[in-house]
């Protein structure tokens, strides 16, 4: 029989560094899900992470407040990581999103639990 999951005392969310590998992976995942769900032909990427928090439960909940910007790259293009942001006023678009990502890192899994975005 495999070891079960013991009950755990859950602490509240704590501030996390954007330099943390876990935060970076959660951000990439959330932005990827945002782009999959959006009907925009252009790819968006993070302009800045306004706040990052994490809460360790049975896995890890990441709470990310992110400002997203629309890039000049269409979603079909390869290598979207360094696409420049649109600077033409009629194409420029920003969104402010709050993402909650649930990760079980030792299982290699991530789920977008909550996502709320509004135009900035």
């Amino acid at each position: 029989s495999s070891p079960g999951k013991p009950p755990r005392l859950v602490g509240g969310p704590m501030d996390a560094s954007v330099e943390e590998e876990g935060v970076r992976r959660a951000l990439d995942f959330a932005v990827g899900e945002y782009n999959k769900a959006s009907n925009d032909m252009y790819h968006s990427r993070a302009l800045q992470v306004v706040r990052a928090r994490k809460q360790i439960v049975a896995g890890v909940n990441y709470f990310l407040d992110v400002e997203l910007g629309r890039t000049t790259c269409t979603k079909t293009q390869p290598n979207l990581d360094n696409c420049p942001f649109h600077d033409q006023p009629h194409l420029k678009r920003k969104a402010f999103c709050s993402f909650q990502i649930y990760a079980v890192p030792w299982q290699g899994t991530m789920t977008l639990s909550k996502s709320t975005c509004q135009d900035a």
């Epitope: 495999s2 070891p3 999951k5 943390e20 590998e21 290699g108 899994t109």
Partner: antibody, heavy 117, light 111 residues
Framework: EVQLLESGGGLVQPGGSLRLSCAAS????????MNWVRQAPGKGLEWVGL????????YYADSVKGRSTISRDNSKNTLYLQMNSLRAEDTAVYYC??????????WGQGTLVTVSS | QSVLTQPPSASGTPGQRVTISCTGS?????????VHWYQQLPGTAPKLLIY???NRPSGVPDRFSGSKSGTSASLAISGLRSEDEADYYC???????????FGGGTKLTVL
């Protein structure tokens, strides 16, 4: 009973390649992440990397990143570790280990990889 | 240099109680991740001894116990027996490295 059987180890020259296999039985292989952990002779344990249940996600230790690839075939209940550009410091016993709970809970008996000219 | 720090050796006589410490940092144990302990008998593969800080898998005697506080954890072995002579390793997930990290191992000698 969970069983993990590693194979594919042996003597390889520096710069060479090797593919290790881990045959799993006694649990639902396709439901869980799998890991490779190594142990150099007379040294401690070092995690090499993991692969998610569906094979879509892999994480690697910095020491092997770019030189190793973990894959799995759920239809064959088998885990793989492809190692390239091997160095003397890769000499170790390589273990596969399951994560059916919250840790590395079951381990194979290991296979020895020796990198030497 | 291991990410988690353990004493290289520990010893005790039969019947005694020994403890082995494991010290981490704010990116692993201190972040709130569980600590797990492994026993490696000479010439064999590691075996899970304690998971989730304090829990024993079935078949592990209650002479083995674990605890965790802050950035450290401990493994205690009471009623020491000759068959406990082995290497003991602690492990935890690490946020910065995004992988499992281990202590350097503690060689337990039963005198």
């Amino acid at each position: 009973e969970v069983q993990l059987l590693e194979s594919g180890g042996g003597l390889v020259q520096p710069g060479g390649s090797l593919r290790l296999s881990c045959a799993a039985s006694g649990f639902t292989f396709s439901s869980y992440a799998m890991n490779w952990v190594r142990q150099a002779p007379g040294k401690g344990l070092e995690w090499v990397g993991l692969i998610s249940y569906d094979g879509r996600t892999t994480y690697y230790a910095d020491s092997v990143k770019g030189r190793s690839t973990i894959s799995r075939d759920n239809s064959k209940n088998t885990l793989y570790l492809q190692m390239n550009s091997l160095r003397a410091e890769d000499t170790a016993v390589y273990y596969c280990a399951t994560t059916t709970g919250t840790t590395l809970d079951y381990w194979g008996q290991g296979t020895l990889v020796t990198v030497s000219s | 240099q291991s990410v988690l720090t353990q004493p290289p050796s520990a010893s005790g006589t039969p019947g005694q109680r020994v403890t082995i410490s494991c010290t981490g940092s704010s990116s692993n144990i201190g972040a709130g991740y569980d600590v797990h302990w492994y026993q490696q008998l000479p010439g064999t593969a590691p075996k899970l001894l304690i998971y989730g800080n304090t829990n024993r898998p079935s078949g592990v005697p209650d002479r083995f116990s674990g605890s965790k506080s802050g950035t450290s954890a401990s493994l205690a072995i009471s009623g020491l027996r000759s068959e406990d002579e082995a290497d003991y390793y602690c492990a935890a997930w690490d946020d910065s490295l995004y992988g499992w990290v281990f202590g350097g191992g503690t060689k337990l000698t039963v005198l």
